[in-house]
């Protein structure tokens, strides 16, 4: 029967005994960084080439003992999870590979950035398809390498990596923490981070997503028939590798900003026990475990966002953190967070040409984080409206005041530390749904955007008494581009978008008293596009 | 059930060119493999190659390289083997068999081909 | 390539007799990896194709009855029929197909004393 990894990433419309997707990403030519492969196993024979190229460190122990299987293990099955002929995922994908990783698995910063550039040579010399780079391999944190893959996934390729098996966060490694590289993290069968020994899965806000990665079975170097059951992030990262080439076979013309958020709109929701994560990376990490669109034609009609947070600012009173979106993506709204409660809210502001979203932390405050909402919007133009602090006791009030400019977020930022501690709430007037309001004591910021049949609305979601989460969602059809809180008191602990959920966290029940104060109401902007949608309908 | 029905027997002479058939029922053709195994009079059994109906990909015992062609239409869930050119050293039962990564040993045999290679 | 050589070419055990087949490969055919052994038997009867006996060296494929039993690994195997019956009659291979080329050994005839 079908191995249970292959089922698990399989949507219900292809379920049968066997794993037979249509197209199996022959269109696309996956490499892979690692150890040695056993290239005549039967599961990848004529599938994978191996090229001349390597580069690793000595094997360290006097004693060492190169046993020719033991040193291609690693990466042979890797090889096989991605394309093997049984139990592969896009098994119609070619592979080339790359010593980079010793017998004993181990490799060097700079055996890895000459692979890279080993890779964007071969890419200019003979251009093919779309290329996927697949580095399952974690090292400490490194600039150099996490700049090499940026200027990698710049010339169009899309890397894949490993989130590490530290059980740790995955932002303190590389390439792990390039936010050019899609990070993947490891899950079981029943869903759950993977453990390995008294580690496991890496999370954090920078893993993308999870994939199965625990008793997986593919190819052996023992034998050309022998098959092994291994775990770890590079298993999952394999698989997150297999369903690019799936994808970018069915749509060679995708970018990797688009690439990304397929796989992210595409994977399970919500099927991880976030208690196995420290409990201040719960909400960092992405509850999502990657799986393969139900169809092999792209959802193009579909308005994609995903949610990017930010490394935390740290404590002092003027830290400030920033949230960026991916080049081809488009910032439609910012929101902030803090533990403590503690912050001065958040902005949009222009940065080297982009807009990105930054939060500040408030005096005694533990710190802040800052969450962008990045959309795939073509011909979108997008700009922020700000407002001062008003004088008015009605509290300050921003819309979008351009011809065909809709609202698709809204934020707002103060001076003052104890904001709104003894302010009635703020209530938006009926009738007004286009426009962001806030304490007068705050400025606020409007993200107002124009895009061919682009159309948002407002969906709020008010509960009188204390709270500590209050959640609104956007209907089937529409995707959620902006999450914000009304009001701004100072129980509010902030807001962020959970797929298509706006989730406004407040402080424990019990420490607010059940006062007109306690009144939480969760503000999400949904909006789609008519034009996609019909763009869409036109190609089928 | 799950089969593997072989084409009928051949007379041919030297020189001349064969391709015999192997049908899979039963079965998901595309995710195992097919085998051919040669079986001369009165001998033992030799393992010729196999393919993946899958990609068409072929693995050939070195002994039979160059000799014989393996390969498969998908479509209509067929095998085959097929000589250009008939030696009479060529003539035996030639059987296909089928196996799958967690079970690499044959587990179903058609029921041969007796090929004849005379003048 | 992984020889396999058999013993004996022949066998003739009275009806209810014990029938011992051995098989040895030229290197090992067993794997850390699972642990298992790669090594198969098959029954050929006069007219019919090889049949599957015992597979992973030991376990009785579905049908098969369990007089016929398997053992051994790395490079010595043997096939033991407990109570040898009329219907068993066959020429009996083994086979290894942990790489390639997959290779045979040469036979044991089976006949009744």
């Known amino acids: 029967s079908i191995p249970w990894n292959l089922e698990r990433i399989t949507p219900p419309r292809y379920r049968a005994d066997e794993y037979q997707p249509p197209d199996g990403g022959s269109l696309v030519e996956v490499y892979l960084l690692d150890t040695s492969i056993q290239s005549d196993h039967r599961e990848i024979e004529g599938r994978v080439m191996v090229t001349d190229f390597e580069n690793v460190p000595e094997e360290d122990g006097t004693r060492f003992h190169r046993q020719a299987s033991k040193c291609d293990s690693h990466g042979t099955h890797l090889a096989g999870v991605v394309s093997g002929r049984d139990a592969g995922v896009a098994k119609g994908a070619s592979m080339r590979s790359l010593r980079v990783l010793n017998c004993q698995g181990k490799g060097t910063v700079s055996g890895t950035l000459i692979g890279l550039e080993f890779i964007r040579k071969s890419q200019l010399v003979q251009p093919v398809g779309p290329l996927v780079v697949l580095l399952p391999l974690a090292g400490g944190y490194s600039r150099v390498l996490n700049a090499a893959c940026q200027r990698l996934a710049r010339a169009g390729v899309v890397l894949v990596t490993a989130a590490g098996n530290f059980r740790d966060d995955a932002c303190l490694y590389s390439p792990a923490s390039a936010p050019e590289v899609i990070t993947v993290g490891a899950t079981n069968a029943q869903d759950q981070p993977v453990t390995l020994g008294t580690l496991g899965t890496n999370f954090g806000r920078c893993v993308d997503l999870f994939a199965p990665g625990e008793d997986i079975i593919g190819a052996s170097s023992d034998c050309s028939t022998c098959f092994v059951s291994q775990s770890g992030t590079s298993q999952a990262a394999a698989h997150v590798a297999g369903i690019a080439a799936m994808m970018l076979s069915a749509e060679p013309e995708l970018t990797l900003a688009e690439l990304r958020q397929r796989l992210i709109h595409f994977s399970a929701k919500d099927v991880i026990n976030e208690a196995w994560f420290p409990e201040d990376q719960r909400v960092l990490t992405p509850n999502l475990v990657a799986a393969l669109p139900p169809s092999t034609h792209g959802a193009g009609w579909q308005l994609f966002c995903r949610t990017v947070w930010s490394a935390h600012s740290g404590p002092t009173r003027m830290a400030t953190a920033v949230a960026r979106c991916a080049p081809d993506e488009e910032l439609l709204s910012c929101s902030s967070f803090s533990r403590s409660g503690k912050r001065r809210g958040e902005r949009m502001e222009a940065q080297g040409g982009k807009l990105v979203c930054r939060a500040h932390n408030a005096f005694g405050g533990e710190g802040v984080y800052a969450i962008a909402r990045c959309c795939l919007l073509p011909q979108a133009n997008c700009s922020v409206h700000t407002a001062p602090p008003a004088e008015a006791s009605m509290g300050t009030r921003v819309h979008c005041h351009q011809q065909g400019h809709v609202l698709t977020g809204c934020s707002s930022h103060w001076e003052v530390e104890d904001l709104g501690t003894h302010k009635p709430p703020v209530l938006r007037p009926r009738g007004q749904p286009n426009q962001c309001v806030g304490h007068r004591e705050a400025s606020i910021h409007a993200s107002c955007c124009h895009a061919p049949g682009l159309e948002c609305k407002v969906k709020e979601h008010g509960i009188p008494a204390p709270q500590e989460q209050v959640t609104v969602a956007c209907e089937e059809g529409w995707t959620l581009t902006g999450c914000s809180a009304l009001p701004g008191t100072s129980h509010v602990l902030g807001a962020y978008a959970v797929d298509n959920t706006c989730v406004v966290r407040s402080r424990d029940v019990s420490t607010t008293g059940s006062t007109s104060e306690g009144a939480v109401t969760a503000v999400a902007i949904c909006c789609r596009s008519r034009h996609l949608a019909q763009a869409s309908q036109e190609l089928q | 059930q799950v089969q593997l029905v072989q084409s009928g027997a051949e007379v041919k002479k030297p020189g001349e060119s064969l391709k015999i058939s192997c049908k899979g029922s039963?079965?998901?053709?595309?995710?195992?493999?097919i085998s051919w195994v040669r079986q001369m009079p009165g001998k033992g059994l030799e393992w010729m190659g196999w393919?993946?109906?899958?990609?068409?990909?072929?693995h050939y015992n070195p002994m039979f390289q160059g000799q014989v062609t393996i390969s498969a239409d998908k479509s209509i869930s067929t095998a085959y083997l097929q000589w250009s050119s008939l030696k009479a050293s060529d003539t035996a039962m030639y059987y296909c068999?089928?196996?799958?990564?967690?079970?690499?040993?044959?587990?179903?045999w058609g029921q041969g081909t007796l090929v004849t290679v005379s003048s | 390539d992984i020889v396999m050589t058999q013993s004996p070419d022949s066998l003739a055990v009275s009806l209810g007799e014990r029938a011992t087949i051995n098989c040895r490969s030229s290197?090992?055919?067993?794997?850390?990896?699972?642990?298992?052994?790669?090594l198969a038997w098959y029954q050929q009867k006069p007219g019919q194709p090889p049949k599957l006996l015992i597979y992973?060296?030991?376990t009785r494929e579905s049908g098969v009855p369990d007089r016929f039993s398997g053992s051994g690994s790395g490079t010595d195997f043997t096939l033991t029929i407990s109570s040898l019956q009329a219907e068993d009659v066959a020429v009996y291979y083994c086979?290894?197909?942990?790489?390639?080329?997959?290779?045979f050994g040469q036979g044991t005839k089976v006949e009744i004393k």
């Open positions: 068999a089928r196996d799958r990564w967690s079970r690499p040993y044959f587990d179903i």
């Open positions: 039963g079965y998901s053709f595309t995710d195992y493999y």
């Open positions: 393919i993946y109906p899958g990609d068409s990909y072929t």
């Open positions: 290197q090992s055919v067993l794997y850390s990896s699972n642990n298992k052994n790669y």
């Open positions: 992973w060296a030991s």
């Open positions: 086979q290894q197909y942990s790489s390639f080329p997959i290779t």
